[in-house]
Interface confidence: medium
């Protein structure tokens, strides 16, 4: 059975389908640009009692008195956007610690580096992936996922945290980027656009895809997320682009069909366990990899990003449901929740396959400018 959107067609669809980039090519940061804040208009983050920061929200750090093995992360500052003067009372819902917290949001002030200095770092995410410049690295072996096929019970928490929809994953989902590079999955969340406007975080040769899924993992070398933040390889994110296809994606429908229940910012529901691996592309052998950061405050660096070459297909109706159901605080829909691409600043994106050879319809002839940094591994 032929896999949809394989690299043989073109890398990640090669920009041949999906919407135009709302930022435009000229809006993509150059190598010299400092990291930019979010271009798309977005929503502020008004965390609820369990709303947690990071990519998108990492588990919070529980006090020592609670169970020992829990993966938790202390609340970090987020930036409060001004409320809607039309309805001050109803835009001012806060958790009871809200007065002590600031809030971040997509699009507009305050600048993220003021929220978390790491957001001004040199090695930030997301980035624009240029397959022609990727370094083919034969040492990058197929990803290994274990325990991702979850039974219906226990149910999982699906939450609208005001800046994404997030599914909290139970213990036992193991992922290996390679020998000795083992991780545990913590949560997954999505990034999307709006009607007629794509919303993936990463881009390919300037092409933005309709949406993107992130599965966030913690290295088994660390017991807690806060220990791993900022440490090279402490966190790893699997990312896949979502594209429009002719058929409904049954795996995604298990989540998308429940979004109306959590349309309100801060709300949550319980969903039956599902096959998490079915939310990802089927080809675990062809991917791009680089070291970057969380794409939301605290923007901690040292995150290993693995971006699948193959995309995942959702129906047009499903993509519309994703981008048009959830709400942020106030009278704002939760849309365009992606960060602008950040400069590579000398980083080399590695590919597990020869992405620069006969892979892009835009290339006149194949070139391979970068060599694999991990060739000796």
């Amino acid at each position: 059975q032929r896999l949809p959107r394989m690299q043989e067609d073109s890398p990640l669809g090669g920009g041949s389908s999906g919407e135009d980039d709302p930022l435009g090519e000229e809006d993509l940061p150059s190598e010299e640009d400092s990291p930019r804040e979010e271009d798309p208009p977005g929503e502020e983050d008004l965390p609820g009692e369990e709303d947690l920061p990071g990519e998108e929200d990492l588990p919070e750090v529980k006090p020592k008195s609670e169970e020992e093995g829990s993966l938790k992360l202390e609340d970090l500052p987020t930036v409060e956007a001004p409320g809607d003067p039309q309805e001050p009372q109803n835009n001012a819902h806060r958790d009871k610690e809200g007065d002590d917290q600031s809030h971040w949001r997509y699009g507009g002030d305050p600048p993220w580096p003021r929220v978390s200095p790491a957001c001004a770092g040199r090695f930030q995410s997301p980035v624009d992936i240029r397959p022609q410049l990727a370094a083919f690295c034969p040492a990058l072996r197929p990803l290994e996922l274990l325990g991702f096929q979850l039974p219906p019970l226990p149910e999982l928490r699906l939450r609208n945290n005001g800046h994404s929809v997030q599914l909290t994953l139970p213990p036992g989902l193991e992922m290996a980027l390679g020998p000795g590079r083992e991780y545990r999955a913590l949560q997954l969340h999505l990034h999307w656009g709006a009607a007629g406007r794509p919303g993936s975080e990463h881009t390919v040769e300037g092409h933005r895809f309709p949406a993107e899924i992130h599965v966030v993992h913690l290295s088994t070398a660390f017991a807690r997320v806060d220990e791993a933040l900022g440490r090279p390889g402490g966190l790893a994110v699997l990312a896949a682009f979502l594209e429009e296809g002719p058929e409904e994606n049954s795996a995604y429908e298990q989540l998308l069909s429940r979004l109306e229940e959590i349309a309100e910012e801060g709300s949550e529901t319980q969903v039956p366990g599902l096959d998490i691996s079915a939310l990802l592309p089927s080809d675990f052998s062809r991917y791009f990899q680089y070291e970057g950061s969380l794409t939301t405050p605290p923007c901690a660096q040292g995150v290993i990003w693995t971006v699948f070459n193959q995309t995942v297909m959702l129906s047009a109706k499903q993509l519309h449901t994703l981008s048009d159901t959830l709400w942020g605080p106030g009278d704002s829909r939760l849309q365009l929740n992606f960060r602008a691409t950040q400069p590579l600043n000398g980083r080399v994106i590695e590919a597990s396959f020869p992405a620069g050879v006969d892979s892009s319809p835009r290339a006149a002839e194949p070139v391979q400018l970068n060599s694999c940094l991990a060739a000796g591994d």
Partner: antibody, heavy 121, light 111 residues
Framework: EVQLLESGGGLVQPGGSLRLSCAAS????????MTWVRQAPGKGLEWVGI???????WYADSVKGRFTISRDNSKNTLYLQMNSLRAEDTAVYYC???????????????WGQGTLVTVSS | DIQMTQSPSFLSASVGDRVTITCQAS???????LSWYQQKPGKAPKLLIY???NLPSGVPSRFSGSGSGTDFTLTISSLQCEDAATYYC????????????FGGGTKVEIK
């Protein structure tokens, strides 16, 4: 300031009909779920029904098939059509807006001042 | 259908006292499906706590909510004269079917 104002209450005979209105000011109702809640004299609050921002409706078993919730977004008004009224429907009827847009969660703010419906022969 | 059992139905306490009201759901509900309301005589209810634990703007910080699953609690850390009122929990779930119900209410009187 967001305000909800109910109207249409009054005395009606058993088996009769009544339509309550809830007019909103200071906010666009179309983005919000809206609910009706009633309170019989000297009793507690009873949930009647809800209409989502997508205009789906749900009702308490006690009123299902007799009451209908609708809205007119152009008039920024919510309605409760009550048919086949019974003595036990006598209550103050409140409309309330979901505290946050979009969803169906059980947080309603603000509330109208209420309108009294008396079903008696 | 879902039932919300609230207790006590009546309590009398002095100014400055810590007051606790509990609400038990007949089945597990999500934290974001539970809220608390305050109603004073002749007035409409007022949202006091939403998503089980969160305070709307303007609600005094002496009010707090806790709980999950089937058991939820409203606490007034230091009772004030103006807190004399009836308190209701509202709980349920929004899924393919939408079910919600109020608790029976707790009347709080100042001694």
């Amino acid at each position: 300031e967001v305000q909800l104002l109910e109207s249409g209450g009054g005395l009606v005979q058993p088996g009769g009909s009544l339509r309550l209105s809830c007019a909103a000011s200071g906010i666009d109702l179309s983005n919000y779920a809206m609910t009706w809640v009633r309170q019989a004299p000297g009793k507690g609050l009873e949930w009647v029904g809800i209409i989502s921002s997508n205009d789906k409706t749900w009702y308490a078993d006690s009123v299902k098939g007799r009451f209908t919730i609708s809205r007119d977004n152009s008039k920024n008004t919510l309605y409760l059509q009550m048919n086949s009224l019974r003595a036990e429907d006598t209550a103050v009827y409140y409309c309330a807006k979901a505290a946050m847009p979009g969803g169906l969660k059980n947080a309603f703010d603000p509330w109208g001042q209420g309108t009294l419906v008396t079903v008696s022969s | 259908d879902i039932q919300m059992t609230q207790s006590p139905s009546f309590l009398s306490a002095s100014v400055g006292d810590r007051v606790t009201i509990t609400c038990q759901a007949s089945q597990t509900i999500g934290g974001s499906d539970l809220s608390w309301y305050q109603q004073k005589p002749g007035k409409a209810p007022k949202l006091l706590i939403y998503y089980a634990t969160n305070l709307p703007s303007g609600v005094p910080s002496r009010f707090s909510g806790s709980g999950s699953g089937t058991d939820f609690t409203l606490t007034i850390s230091s009772l004030q004269c103006e807190d004399a009122a009836t308190y209701y929990c509202l709980g349920g779930y929004a899924a393919a079917s939408y079910r919600t119900a109020f608790g029976g209410g707790t009347k709080v009187e100042i001694k």
